[in-house]
Interface confidence: low
């Protein structure tokens, strides 16, 4: 089956978080600074006319830009989209902001920068002070935070209101813990390199974040191929060489927000094995309940059968017993010259009572490493509210 | 403003590298620095971009593909090397700013210019 | 290849007059990828129009784009003598896989 099992589709984790329709109150919407009472953070919401009609910060922007508008979403979010406006002022605004840059959290103390697929930092804004710009984020970003820095290339006044729309990210799933994806030659380079991963690298180790393996993006059968528009070969996998892990797997860990039963865990991989890509022989895991806890039991070890020769991608489904854990070790074994993996996703169900590491409150300073990106698609609540999702922008997948 | 420089006359088979010197702006800000050339009494013709960001992507016409290659050389500088070089080759070669929207790897347009160099391709 | 063809040139205005000058492309586009511009002898093209319709800093309001799919038109209205040039459209989209491409340019003679 090439199918990921509860696999979100992207596509529809796109409804309104909050902003407009006020589902999140004032009290999540802060700010570095406001020009006027008139003008603070909780004004700042998409369609709004409240106060002076936006949020304005006290200083310049430019050229510091390190004035924000911070949402807080209380819980984890995956946030696909996000909208911009000018300030209202009963038609009278003139403020507005052509570009910003967006930082994200998981926990309120590491802070991302939201980068495009080529590395762009910078979004463009507005045109004028009414028109709502909706920007999609390719790739998206799991937070339970955003701060928009709105940027100006001159000394002049900017105002902001905004939206942002996703989906909730209830798979639980914090961070990947993987080797850094490697590059495979053929005619033209393929590079398998994990290229949204927002953890830190080290050493050849990526750990702490997620990436391309928890964005929703299902990889082609054809590795060199991508679902995504003007990207570079092999942009849809992380993969790694046999010749380069002597012990002949690879080794990965995941770190999830609480205790949960873990039924299964699925791999979608490439087997274009003309190539070099093979589905893993096997997979190999271990589980226990704390970072500085022994691994517990024996490792779940489960062999892979199937039609092998067969070249299409598939989602390997790899059953973990209901074992109860919230960091996963798994052991990835070679099959072939070169493993390939697009998405990784668990099925689980969270343990009664097991206190949660994000929430309500933050957690407490993350273990290094830490585990896996938020992975599991059917983690995301698609229709939170009854709403619709807002519709895809015109272009490429991620705009 | 952009300047471009290195024009000349030489002959088919020769090489030849085109320099476009920006001032005013930066690329570090994220722009797509191209060449269009203009073969005389002829229309405009896109040769290649580059996005000046973080990394290095370049895109070429087809027809342009292993025989130009571009690059930037510096924070304020943007080459055009020129290989195998016939007559067909003959042209006032631009450098132009490609400003864009949405994320880069889209849409772009050249909102400034330079005043373009002749290369001249003669036996 | 995505290939854009223009509108033959040469077309005539009169002073006052409005004029039309289209693009078409082989395949659809979006809107988004496709610019105008206005190139005089001697000088370097000039932007006109960019995203199919929103007008560039400085130009005048008598310039304006329209279209979507794979056509594409520029209007002058209230033509004057200055607008006596060739016009070229571009469909920019880095690094898709049907390559950037000019239109082959049409030129305005002014009466």
């Known amino acids: 089956d090439a199918d990921m099992k509860g696999h979100f589709d992207p596509a529809k984790c796109r409804y309104a978080l909050g902003m407009q329709d006020r589902t999140i109150p004032d009290s999540d919407i802060s700010a570095s600074s406001s020009w006027s009472d008139s003008t603070a953070a909780r004004h700042s919401r998409l369609e709004s006319s409240d106060g002076d009609g936006a949020w304005c910060p006290a200083g310049s922007v430019f050229p510091k830009e390190e004035e924000y508008l911070q949402v807080d979403l209380q819980r984890l979010h995956l946030v696909a989209l996000v909208g911009t406006q000018g300030r209202h002022a009963g038609g009278l605004g003139k403020e507005f902001s052509r570009s910003y840059r967006l930082r994200y959290s998981r926990d309120g103390r590491r802070w991302m920068g939201w980068k495009d697929r080529w590395g762009q930092e910078v979004i463009s804004g507005n045109e004028d002070p009414e028109g709502v710009v909706l920007k999609d984020l390719g790739p998206p970003m799991v937070a339970r935070l955003v701060r928009f820095y709105p940027r100006a290339d001159r000394v002049m006044s900017v105002c902001l209101r905004v939206e942002l729309y996703g989906c909730l990210w209830r798979d639980g799933l914090l961070s990947y813990t993987a080797p850094v994806g490697q590059t495979m030659y053929l005619s033209e380079a393929v590079y398998l390199n994990d290229s949204t991963y927002d953890g830190h690298t080290v050493g050849g180790l990526q750990y702490g974040g997620l990436g391309q393996l928890a964005d929703g993006v299902v990889g082609l059968d054809d590795f060199r191929k991508s679902q995504e528009l003007r990207v570079w070969p092999g942009y849809d996998y992380v993969g790694w060489s046999n010749h380069s892990f002597s012990s002949g797997y690879v080794e990965m860990e995941f770190e999830f927000d609480r205790l949960r039963a873990f039924q299964a865990m699925q791999v979608h991989c490439n087997n274009m094995h003309t190539l070099g890509a093979r589905l893993p022989g096997g997979v190999e895991c271990r589980f226990r309940r704390g970072p500085a806890m022994a691994w517990e039991g024996e490792p779940m070890r489960h062999n892979l059968g199937g039609n092998l020769g067969d070249p299409r991608a598939r989602a390997v489904s790899v059953p973990l017993g209901g074992r109860v854990a919230r960091f996963l070790q798994c052991r990835f074994l070679f099959a072939g010259p070169w493993l390939l993996f697009s998405e990784i996703s668990f099925i689980s169900d969270v343990v009664n009572n097991s206190s949660p590491a994000l929430g309500g409150t933050f957690p407490p300073a993350p273990w290094w490493p830490p585990g896996p990106p938020p992975t599991n698609f059917s983690s995301l609540e698609l229709e939170p509210r009854g709403q619709q999702p807002v519709a895809k922008a015109e272009g490429s997948p991620t705009a | 403003s952009l300047e471009e420089s290195g024009g000349d006359l030489v002959k088919p088979g020769a090489s030849l590298t085109l320099t476009c010197t920006a001032s005013?702006?930066?690329?570090?800000?994220?722009?797509?620095m191209c060449w269009v050339r203009q073969a005389p009494g002829k229309g405009l013709e896109w040769i290649a971009c580059i996005y000046t960001g973080r990394t290095d992507f370049t895109d070429y016409a087809s027809w342009a593909k292993g025989r130009f290659t571009i690059s930037k050389t510096s924070s304020t500088t943007v080459t055009l090397q020129l290989t195998t070089l016939t007559a067909a080759d003959t042209a006032t070669y631009f450098c132009?700013?490609?400003?864009?929207?949405?994320?880069?790897?889209?849409?772009?347009?050249?909102?400034?210019w330079g005043q373009g160099t002749l290369v001249t391709i003669s036996s | 290849e995505l290939v854009m063809t223009q509108t033959a040139s040469p077309v005539s205005a009169a002073v006052g007059g409005t004029v039309t000058i289209n693009c078409q492309a082989s395949?659809?586009?979006?809107?988004?990828?496709l610019s105008w511009y206005q190139q005089k002898p001697g000088q370097p093209p000039k932007l006109l129009i960019y995203k199919a319709s929103i007008l560039a800093s400085g130009v005048p309001s008598r310039f304006s784009g329209s279209g979507s799919g794979t056509e594409y038109t520029l209007t002058i209205s209230g033509v004057q003598c200055d607008d006596a040039a060739t016009y070229y459209c571009l469909y920019g989209g880095f690094g898709s896989s049907t390559g950037d491409a000019f239109g082959g340019g049409t030129v305005l003679v002014v009466k």
């Open positions: 395949q659809s586009i979006g809107s988004t990828y």
């Open positions: 005013g702006f930066s690329f570090s800000s994220g722009y797509y």
């Open positions: 132009a700013r490609g400003d864009y929207s949405g994320g880069v790897g889209g849409n772009y347009w050249l909102d400034l």
